[in-house]
């Protein structure tokens, strides 16, 4: 099985032309688009990638690029306006020459005598670098996503093909297939390859069946497989959970809404460092777990798991992964305990009475929207957030 990719070597989702033999196809890729089949055109010059000149970008070059990338024909070719003002117009007669510095920054052009990639060549310093970039949207604008998994790195696998998002059948779906998905999406490596019904079923077409990746492919659609067959239903939609996906649980409390904060990330459960665990982080976690709001942040215990995760939230985020976060890969939380939280929906808040003391019922309003009934206010000290 392929070993997990180190987190600092996660691939991006732009179309990598290194897959081609030198001279076999165009050294081009598309970046900053909605998929690997749309975006700004970049050409490879020795060791670097440079944006292709927009001034010399035409429909023949656009068609050739789309075909070379396996994205069908070109649907739309355009120039991206420069981010800064364009260069001044040609110098008036008598002005001193600016060629010495202007040409050094010349941009490469992809020049094609026809719509076939064999008829194209990259010409260096073909344009002044006025900031105009060549852009293209290809007809087969393919893309990939994971949906309904609580984040961009987990969920039901969906491919965009021929303008429609559709599922992948789980027949023969395994970790190698999920690896390709995770790497393509910049989500690390696959932690789980899941069969149907782990996530909500899809509604669109089923684009692929019998997918059989080696694990080395750059894109899911490069893997061997069959078109989606009629006998494959949405109960069999393939899913994946990638290493960069985060999920949370509370452990060691009365129920799932109280306890030590643990995050599943990069294949293992980790505790969270309480040195940066404040009311805003606790509030986001309780709400994302469906546990109401945070009522208390009990003093933490020593880390029972490797504690490497820190969060910093403003309190309005939907999940902790939407907050600013960092995962310290080399050191455990220094001089901190494991973060803990008590959420308002925990049943431990409703079982605080003691037989000796008559129950006096008091209503406490927290965060102006959550009402909690507490019997015998002396029996438990609440830290209101």
């Amino acid at each position: 099985h392929p070993s997990p990719a180190p987190p600092d070597q996660l691939n991006t989702s732009s179309a990598e032309s290194e897959l081609w033999e030198p001279g076999e196809r165009l050294p081009v890729r598309l970046t900053n688009g909605s998929s690997s089949c749309s975006g700004t055109v970049e050409v490879r010059l020795e060791a670097s990638w440079e944006p292709a000149c927009g001034a010399l970008w035409d429909s023949r070059a656009a068609e050739a690029v789309c075909r070379a990338l396996g994205c069908g024909g070109a649907e739309a070719a355009s120039q991206l306006a420069p981010p800064t003002p364009e260069l001044p117009p040609p110098p008036a007669a008598g002005n001193t020459s600016v060629a010495a510095n202007a040409t050094l920054a010349g941009a490469p052009a992809l020049l094609c005598s026809g719509a076939e990639w064999r008829l194209c060549e990259v010409v260096e310093h073909a344009c002044r670098s006025d900031g105009r970039r060549a852009r293209v949207t290809c007809a087969e604008n393919r893309a990939l996503r994971l949906v309904d998994g609580g984040g961009a790195c987990a969920g039901r696998v969906e491919m965009l093909e021929h303008g429609e998002w559709g599922s992948v059948c789980d027949d023969t779906w395994d970790l190698e297939d999920a690896h390709v998905v995770c790497r393509q999406l910049g989500c690390g490596w696959a932690v789980q390859a899941l069969p149907g019904l782990h996530f909500t079923p899809g509604r669109g077409p089923i684009h692929r069946d019998q997918v059989n990746c080696s694990g080395a492919e750059a894109y899911l659609w490069d893997c061997p497989g069959l078109p989606g067959q009629h006998y494959c239903g949405h109960k069999e939609d393939a899913g994946a959970v990638c290493s960069e996906h985060q999920s949370w649980r509370l452990t060691g409390g009365a129920d799932r809404c109280e306890g030590q904060v643990e995050v599943h990330f990069r294949g293992v459960w980790n505790t969270v460092c309480d040195s940066e665990w404040y009311p805003s982080e606790a509030k986001v976690l309780c709400q994302s777990l469906g546990c109401g709001t945070a009522v208390e942040r009990p003093k933490g215990l020593p880390h029972s798991l490797s504690g490497r995760m820190y969060y910093s939230c403003n309190g309005e985020e939907l999940t902790l992964s939407n907050c600013s976060w960092r995962f310290n890969n080399s050191n455990l939380c220094s001089q901190s305990l494991a973060a803990r939280v008590l959420c308002s929906a925990s049943r431990s808040l409703h079982n605080l009475s003691t037989p000796e003391v008559p129950a006096s019922v008091q209503t406490v309003t927290i965060e102006s929207s959550v009402t909690v009934k507490i019997e015998n206010k002396e029996s438990r000290e609440l830290m209101l957030l």
């Epitope: 001193t96 020459s97 010349g106 310093h125 344009c127």
Partner: nanobody
Framework: QVQLVESGGGLVQAGGSLRLSCSAS????????LGWFRQAPGKEREFVAA????????YYADSVKGRFTISRDNSKNTLYLQMNSLRAEDTAVYYC????????????????WGKGTLVTVSS
């Protein structure tokens, strides 16, 4: 205003050679990418060859690759087109062009056109 004046055209036998020149009035000649277009009788104007500002990059139409060579001498404000192994289909009026923003491969980037010089290749 850049004045471009072509010379060197004429009648030549198929298989022969010619060298076209284009001189420019502009002192800032080296600020322009230069090229050649041609127009045969009854046909559309077509790209032939182009060269960038300092002469480090060139580009040719497929029909002339390996036979024609474009070059420039910035100290003389002159552009050249060396044409070898001429064919009857090379017969056309040849235009010198200058472009500020990009190599003059597509007509929409061209700032200045010369008046042209006629090349006739007899078979």
């Amino acid at each position: 205003q850049v004045q471009l004046v072509e010379s060197g055209g004429g009648l030549v036998q198929a298989g022969g050679s010619l060298r076209l020149s284009c001189s420019a009035s502009e002192r800032t000649f080296s600020d322009y990418a230069l090229g050649w277009f041609r127009q045969a009788p009854g046909k559309e104007r077509e790209f032939v060859a182009a060269i960038n500002w300092v002469g480090g990059s060139t580009y040719y139409a497929d029909s002339v690759k390996g036979r024609f060579t474009i070059s420039r001498d910035n100290s003389k404000n002159t552009l050249y087109l060396q044409m070898n192994s001429l064919r009857a289909e090379d017969t056309a009026v040849y235009y010198c062009v200058a472009s500020w923003g990009a190599m003059p491969v597509l007509t929409h980037v061209i700032n200045y056109w010369g008046k042209g010089t006629l090349v006739t290749v007899s078979s």
